[in-house]
Interface confidence: low
Amino acid sequence: GDTRPRFLWQPKRECHFFNGTERVRFLDRYFYNQEESVRFDSDVGEFRAVTELGRPDAEYWNSQKDILEQARAAVDTYCRHNYGVGESFTVQRRVQPKVTVYPSKTQPLQHHNLLVCSVSGFYPGSIEVRWFLNGQEEKAGMVSTGLIQNGDWTFQTLVMLETVPRSGEVYTCQVEHPSVTSPLTVEWRARSESAQSK
Amino acid sequence: IKEEHVIIQAEFYLNPDQSGEFMFDFDGDEIFHVDMAKKETVWRLEEFGRFASFEAQGALANIAVDKANLEIMTKRSNYTPITNVPPEVTVLTNSPVELREPNVLICFIDKFTPPVVNVTWLRNGKPVTTGVSETVFLPREDHLFRKFHYLPFLPSTEDVYDCRVEHWGLDEPLLKHWEFDAPSPLPETTE
């Protein structure tokens, strides 16, 4: 294979937004290989060397009045500006989750099973998934994949409930998400038949 | 206090491959990248291009500066090369799997550097190219990279899939397997 040494340069300009655009922090960061060498932090107001490798750049950029002024203005000219341009399709993007409940394996009643609540295709990633048994919230025996980013502006998560289903029990997966005003609920009823569908 | 949102303009330039990237990231998702060969803006979701525009020429100018800066830093570091960090690979589906219902396999390649990978989808051991897509290299907070590859497919009990990943940090290609799990009862939905 190709064993030649590699050399990587990574600039990153970061805008961190708090409470909309009320508070904004701008970071102009530079990485050689995987190591940060120099940065401008709007909370600091000047360029700082992060490693010795970045010292010449920090000193030079701080000596250049126009570069420093541009960096200090970036919270407005760059960050708030870009937030405004993209807000409608990023900050305000809402995609409702599709919620499905199924047992992880086909088991007769009164056998240990994992009930899976699959929540998929939603945006943004902030979500609350709860399990209820006959109306009472189940807090023990819950296992989750955590939030999974699909890379296409959707998320998914699986929240499993360890349980021994008994006939007549009603399990409910409840999902709260910014795309809906009231929680989404999906029921699963423990029945003796193996195939269950509504 | 944790921020609500983060927008990152992420760039890189890699030698001796002479590969560069310019992209915008919002909360971990790509808004767009600039195709260096075609010199055009590529929106991650088509509809984004209806709400905003980005002049690709500006990115090309940045990449030229990045190339010059990399050469300066390489000399300044006394030609210290990057240490290869091998990827973690996960294969999952876009949504719950139902036999013969269209779905998408996702190969998530994470926590690696440098940003060069060779990814192949295999169906029953044979390479598949029809319908496949991929993201550019996405930045991580630890300054490693992430990447997604996608394969639309029809789940069946006969077919097995692998995502095959080659990276300089791996001694041999890494294969992550996926196959249809034993059937469960039909899923529940309620009003």
């Epitope: 999902v175 989404l184 | 219902e101 009003e191």
Partner: antibody, heavy 120, light 109 residues
Framework: QVQLKESGPALVKPTQTLTLTCTFS??????????VGWIRQPPGKALEWLAL???????YYSTSLKTRLTISKDTSKNQVVLTMTNMDPVDTATYYC????????????WGQGTLVTVSS | DIVLTQPPSVSGAPGQRVTISCSGS????????VQWYQQLPGTAPKLLIY???QRPSGVPDRFSGSKSGTSASLAITGLQSEDEADYYC?????????FGGGTKLTVLG
């Protein structure tokens, strides 16, 4: 229990626009997975799917009629409205609305249908 | 535009078994579930079979559905006079729902 009922004019003139309303009860169109569709049936002929609207406001239309159709919903009123422009005598049919209980699911409950005649 | 092909008519005597076929393509039946609806004269269609072979509650087990490749079929055993009706298959094709042309079932005698 789930019920759907279509309402609209029994008679429309050629070139006019038809507006049909489906009023439903027993379920909510804000529930994940649920959709409401429209299907029509000319006298003595087969069913023809027209349009469907999902819980998340995704809209799907018959390929051959999509330029003439618009589907919309009012979740608070439990109503789905279908408009069809440029009506023609061949559009004479019984128009049904029906519920799909999950994404890409079957039509499990149907309205009784409303006969629309297109004639001058 | 009818995309799924059904025979215009089938018939059978009471107690017999009849099948109704529904033929499509890879993009519809091949990739998706099939539903069957029964339409008694002068009434709205009623869901008979969903997801290829599942019966809604209240549908007698004399009715069964199956799918193979790009075709599906509905079987009715122990034919009864009240089964005389029109039967329609339905699937999807690229997010568009598609119906068959319908089959008229006549119960003889």
């Amino acid at each position: 229990q789930v019920q759907l009922k279509e309402s609209g004019p029994a008679l429309v003139k050629p070139t006019q626009t038809l507006t049909l309303t489906c009023t439903f009860s027993g379920f909510s169109l804000s529930t994940s997975g649920v959709g409401v569709g429209w299907i029509r049936q000319p006298p003595g002929k087969a069913l023809e799917w027209l349009a469907l609207i999902d819980w998340d406001d995704d809209k799907y239309y018959s390929t051959s009629l999509k330029t003439r159709l618009t589907i919309s919903k009012d979740t608070s009123k439990n109503q789905v409205v279908l408009t069809m422009t440029n009506m023609d005598p061949v559009d004479t049919a019984t128009y049904y609305c029906a519920r799909s209980p999950r994404y890409r699911g079957a039509f499990d409950y149907w309205g009784q249908g409303t006969l629309v005649t297109v004639s001058s | 535009d009818i995309v799924l092909t059904q025979p215009p008519s089938v018939s059978g005597a009471p107690g017999q078994r009849v099948t109704i076929s529904c033929s499509g393509s890879e993009s519809n039946i091949g990739n998706n579930y099939v539903q069957w609806y029964q339409q008694l004269p002068g009434t709205a269609p009623k869901l008979l079979i969903y997801d290829n072979n599942q019966r809604p509650s209240g549908v007698p087990d004399r009715f069964s559905g199956s799918k193979s490749g790009t075709s599906a079929s509905l079987a009715i055993t122990g034919l009864q006079s009240e089964d005389e009706a029109d039967y329609y298959c339905q699937s999807y094709d690229m997010n568009v729902h598609v119906f068959g042309g319908g089959t008229k079932l006549t119960v003889l005698g």
